[in-house]
Amino acid sequence: KESCDVQLYIKRQSYHSIFAGDPFKLECPVKYCAHRPQVTWCKLNGTTCVKLEGRHTSWKQEKNLSFFILHFEPVLPSDNGSYRCSANFLSAIIESHSTTLYVTDVKSASERPSKDEMASRPWLLYS
């Protein structure tokens, strides 16, 4: 029997290599059974995850999964960092793994590095 617990399908240690100035959609895939839970995004600041208020978010529905989307319009260098989505379900909080945005500021990059080059430069997180 399928579990009816809410599940948030963000892979552990996942990341996205993106560029400042581009639009980007960060998706939180949500599995639920009857009632869609309330979902929020937060950004990690050390060990604290700070709720993102007043940001453009939307839902996308697919066959057996819903996606809670955080929109970056456009991506800013300050969007660099790790994000987590959380679902409020039956008075419990279910947290996703964090996913990291590696943002390259195109002003300072002579050419766009590849995904693999980005992933091998984790210090970009702290620049």
Epitope: Q13, S14, E95, K115
Partner: antibody, heavy 119, light 112 residues
Framework: EVQLVQSGAEVKKPGESLKISCKTS????????IHWVRQMPGKGLEWIGR????????KYSPSFQGQVTISADKSISTAYLQLSSLKASDTAMYYC????????????WGQGTLVTVSS | EIVLTQSPGTLSLSPGERATLSCRSS???????????LNWLQQKPGQAPRRLIY???KLDSGIPDRFSGSGSGTDFTLTISRLEPEDFAVYYC?????????FGQGTKLEIK
């Protein structure tokens, strides 16, 4: 039935390159990370790197960075390990492993591909 | 990188006995999500490894319950409560908390 079926044994000459495949079935490859692991004759296991078939993102061990290329084609549920400029010291068994990316609820291993590099 | 040190290198026991294998990490394997990503693998001669235990103590599907894992932080143990003939093999611990992921050097469990 869950399966990870790797391509067959290879004998190569130094300087040549090689691409090993790992065909998965019985689960959605997009829900996993595909790892590649080396085992030299009579030795232990060494982690080469990991690919996320959902988006192509790859992480390498510093020991293997620049020597190998890991990739996947999610449309045919197959992962690849490319070895370039082969040396005799690349002679080893190479394994793929598929671990569920969310909660690690499964961890399956391929049968291994024996690569022999000899002049 | 994280160094995993397994002990003993070789363990000689008889069927029916209890086996205790150790894996010590050079740093804590506790991830920031509060979980500890430490696996135990079994490898028999001429075969691929197979996962026995993940997240320190969770038993893989189809693995007999005579296998158990315990520990936290930097010290981990694989216990086989009552050895069966098919348990004699090489056992590896593997951490996938910190990049690059690393394996222990293995413990060979042999028949006494």
């Amino acid at each position: 039935e869950v399966q990870l079926v790797q391509s067959g044994a290879e004998v190569k000459k130094p300087g040549e390159s090689l691409k090993i495949s790992c065909k998965t079935s019985g689960f959605n490859i997009k829900d996993t990370y595909i790892h590649w692991v080396r085992q030299m004759p009579g030795k232990g296991l060494e982690w080469i790197g990991r690919n996320d078939p959902a988006n192509g993102n790859t992480k390498y061990s510093p020991s293997f960075q620049g020597q190998v290329t890991i990739s996947a084609d999610k449309s045919i549920s197959t992962a690849y390990l490319q070895l370039s400029s082969l040396k005799a010291s690349d002679t080893a068994m190479y394994y793929c492993a598929s671990y569920e990316g969310y909660y690690e609820r499964f961890g399956y291993w391929g049968q291994g591909t024996l690569v022999t590099v000899s002049s | 990188e994280i160094v995993l040190t397994q002990s003993p290198g070789t363990l000689s026991l008889s069927p029916g006995e209890r086996a205790t294998l150790s894996c010590r990490s050079s740093q804590s394997l506790l991830d920031r999500d509060g979980k500890t990503y430490l696996n135990w693998l079994q490898q028999k001669p001429g075969q691929a490894p197979r996962r026995l235990i993940y997240l320190v103590s969770k038993l893989d599907s189809g693995i007999p319950d005579r296998f158990s894992g315990s520990g936290s932080g930097t010290d981990f143990t694989l216990t086989i409560s009552r050895l069966e003939p098919e348990d004699f093999a090489v056992y590896y611990c593997w951490q996938d908390t910190h990049f690059p992921y690393t394996f222990g050097q293995g413990t060979k469990l042999e028949i006494k």
